[in-house]
């Protein structure tokens, strides 16, 4: 902390300008009025203060606003935001999307820092839900943002926000997250026609149940193997050979290359070898002819 000393004669700052970069830390502390700093925060961004000088400016703002900065100051923090701790940010009440954008811009190109994570958390909690504009903004800055949320947090995403999601935003999502997002996407895109619907829903299919995959198989969608490999194993197992053939269309040939990997491997084990042979791909491991298949799960449900 900078020692309190009187401001030298003639050095009292009348405005925040570049002359202040030549001030020592104690001079900044003594000669810059915190209220002046707060009203001219937008100027700080254009002036190359050193890390040490920024510490002094932050200290002045902390003294002026011990309960947390007002949004009028937060919006203009600029690179001073990088000096804030998560504890500082938890005191803030950020409601404007413009403020959020301004601060995310400062951190652009870097990993999501604890400060940014706290800021986003405060913002979303303040809004009550992850609306489309917010999601649009967050995924633009952090494509992996959606997949960093827990299934519980994702449940607050309204279906309308799903329109903002791009395929790359879901790259790191696990099945539990897709289980939450898929029904929202289904609802969001329900009024689209077949081919357009498939283009939009494709990235979310890792959360799709069997009945929806069966329905898609009737629509000539030609699902690619990469999408098929991301489907839930339990959703793929009940599909017949004919249904998988229709679902994949010309991509069905790719099954051979994936026959040792889930979910293809497990699906093969559930199919009759006769049916697999109809594909002409040389897939092996199906149920031999003449064997009886008992569906134990059905039996348990009946008892």
């Amino acid at each position: 902390e900078v020692e309190k000393t009187a401001c030298p004669s003639g050095k009292k700052a009348r405005e925040i300008d570049e002359s202040l970069i030549f001030y020592k830390k104690w001079e900044l502390e003594a000669c810059v009025d915190a209220a002046l700093l707060a009203t001219q925060m937008d100027r700080v961004n254009a002036i190359p203060f050193t890390y040490e000088q920024l510490d002094v400016l932050k200290h002045k703002l902390d003294e002026l606003y011990p309960q947390g900065y007002p949004e009028s100051v937060i919006q203009h923090l600029g690179y001073l935001f990088l000096k804030m701790s998560p504890e500082d940010i938890r005191k803030w009440n950020v409601t404007s999307l413009e403020t959020l954008k301004a601060l995310l811009e400062v951190n652009k190109g870097h990993e999501m820092s604890p400060q940014v994570a706290t800021l986003i958390d405060r913002f979303v909690k303040g809004r009550g839900q992850l609306d489309k504009d917010t999601l649009d903004t967050l995924t633009a800055f952090y494509p992996g943002y959606l997949c960093s949320l827990s299934p519980e947090e994702l449940s607050s995403v309204p279906p309308s926000s799903i329109w903002a999601v791009r395929p790359q935003d879901l790259d790191t999502c696990d099945p539990r997250q897709l289980d939450v997002l898929y029904p929202k996407a289904r609802l969001a895109f329900q009024n689209m026609n077949g081919s357009e619907y498939f283009v939009k829903i494709q990235s979310f299919l890792g959360g799709a149940p069997t009945e929806d995959l069966k329905a898609l198989s009737q629509q000539n969608v030609s699902m690619d193997l990469a999408t098929f490999m991301k489907l839930r194993t339990d959703a793929v197992l009940p599909l017949t050979v004919a249904e998988v053939q229709k679902l994949l269309g010309p991509h069905v040939e790719g099954l051979k290359a994936e026959e040792r990997h889930r979910p293809v491997r497990d699906w093969i084990l559930r199919q009759r070898q006769d049916d697999l042979d109809t594909l002409g791909l040389g897939l092996q491991g199906g149920i031999p002819n003449g064997y009886l298949v008992l569906d134990l799960s059905m039996q348990e449900a009946l008892s």
């Epitope: 570049e18 190359p48 050193t50 600029g78 690179y79 400062v106």
Partner: nanobody, 119 residues
């Protein structure tokens, strides 16, 4: 960044000296260059600086009207013309460069200093 000063020396009161400082090895763009001075047992004090963006110049009250700072950003050089020198101007004059490394802050670079003695 390396800052090399020259032009210091011994001069009589009322005399003049011209200090030069050349910067090399820049990685970031220079925002301003200037001079500070330090005399034995005293803290380093600001003397004068020039900001490249607007060509603005800044002076300590104690040297206003006597010292003139000028520079050439393209040549990475700054000059300090010191006239009407007084014994209290005796100090080691140290060149400073402030570089812009937005958006994370800025860095100061310092020279080794050149000695000025006014008798």
């Amino acid at each position: 960044v390396q800052l090399v000063e020259s032009g210091g020396g011994l001069v009589q009161a009322g005399g003049s000296l011209r200090l030069s400082c050349a910067a090399s090895g820049r990685t970031f763009s220079s925002y301003a260059m200037g001079w500070f001075r330090q005399s034995p047992g005293k803290e380093r004090e600001f003397v004068a600086a020039i900001s490249w963006s607007g060509g603005n110049t800044y002076y300590a009250d104690s040297v206003k009207g006597r010292f003139t700072i000028s520079g050439d950003n393209a040549k990475n050089t700054v000059y300090l013309q010191m006239n009407s020198l007084k014994p209290e101007d005796t100090a080691v004059y140290i060149c400073n460069e402030r570089t812009t490394v937005l958006p994370t802050g800025a860095m100061d670079y310092w020279g080794q200093g050149t000695s000025v003695t006014v008798s």
